[in-house]
Amino acid sequence: KESCDVQLYIKRQSEHSILAGDPFELECPVKYCANRPHVTWCKLNGTTCVKLEDRQTSWKEEKNISFFILHFEPVLPNDNGSYRCSANFQSNLIESHSTTLYVTDVKSASERPSKDEMASRPWLLYR
């Protein structure tokens, strides 16, 4: 049978290469059965994950998945780093894999790796 637990679909080692100054939406795909859980985003700082309380978030739906979105409008250089979403469901806390943002500062955009270089250096990349 299909699980009725809350599930968060962020694939392991998920990475995003983005430009400072651009808008960006970081998605946390959530599957649930009845009541939508309370979902939050946090940013990893060493071993702790600091909750992002005052950031713009929204929900969107596609098929039977709800996406909890963290908005970056625009992306700033210090948005670089790893993020995690978590869902509170019936007093259980479910945490996603972390997803990493690699932010290239627009000032150094001319020095960004070429597409071919990036394709051969998958740790810089995202699926």
Epitope: E2, K11, K115, M118, R127
Partner: antibody, heavy 119, light 111 residues
Framework: DVQLVESGGGLVQPGGSRKLSCAAS????????MHWVRQAPEKGLEWVAY????????YYADTVKGRFTISRDNPKNTLFLQMTSLRSEDTAMYYC????????????WGQGTSVTVSS | DIVLTQSPASLAVSLGQRATISCKAS??????????MNWYQQKPGQPPKLLIY???NLDFGIPARFSGSGSGTDFTLNIHPVEEEDAATYYC?????????FGGGTKLEIK
């Protein structure tokens, strides 16, 4: 409704080139990774290539690496597969497919375009 | 590359009965509790259709008579009760590791 329509197939000489296109509609194309998958006549499915939504990640199957190039034009909602140095074993139906949940599966597929490599 | 071996290559099941298709991976396709196994249905002259992703999750609009289970290297697709429209070839596919690979397919015939 999500729709993917491939085009560009046909008969090609061995060693020749062909560019396939996949026109996408019914979803925000620029937000999704895309794949090419092929199926030789009366055979199973073979994954060919992947491109992420923002083009920063590209992967190829070893069988096509160095010969095929995947690309996309987000403003035009179009995915491409440039095929060069074609061989008889590249004869197949070529499908484009949408990536689901950033690397979990392929959830929508086009009807395919047929490529025959023969002299 | 991860090799997926499907069995049986073909099977015939009576209307209303259960069809069970197995897929064995050459190495584990689990990571931290997630199983990156998908199942597709393909009818002649049509493209594949996603049925199940992440081992057990039904894609939107897929009837509940389809179910997926398994972890590690052993996965199963069950169809119960089988209906006439389920006659097709079924493929398993792993997305744990690049390159993504497919099983050889199982052709289901309805008796």
């Amino acid at each position: 409704d999500v729709q993917l329509v491939e085009s560009g197939g046909g008969l090609v000489q061995p060693g020749g080139s062909r560019k396939l296109s996949c026109a996408a509609s019914g979803f925000t194309f620029s937000s999704f990774g895309m794949h090419w998958v092929r199926q030789a006549p009366e055979k199973g499915l073979e994954w060919v290539a992947y491109i992420s939504s923002g083009i920063s990640t590209i992967y190829y199957a070893d069988t096509v690496k160095g010969r095929f190039t995947i690309s996309r034009d987000n403003p035009k909602n179009t995915l491409f597969l440039q095929m060069t140095s074609l061989r008889s074993e590249d004869t197949a139906m070529y499908y484009c497919a949408r990536d689901w949940l950033r690397g979990y599966a392929m959830d929508y597929w086009g009807q395919g375009t047929s490529v025959t490599v023969s002299s | 590359d991860i090799v997926l071996t499907q069995s049986p290559a073909s099977l015939a099941v009576s209307l209303g009965q259960r069809a069970t298709i197995s897929c064995k991976a050459s190495q584990s396709i689990d990571y931290d509790g997630d199983s990156y196994m998908n199942w597709y249905q393909q009818k002649p002259g049509q493209p594949p259709k996603l049925l199940i992703y992440a081992a057990s999750n039904l894609d939107f609009g897929i009837p509940a008579r389809f179910s997926g289970s398994g972890s590690g290297t052993d996965f199963t697709l069950n169809i119960h009760p089988v209906e006439e429209e389920d006659a097709a070839t079924y493929y398993c596919q792993q997305s744990n590791e690049d390159p993504w690979t497919f099983g050889g397919g199982t052709k289901l015939e309805i008796k």
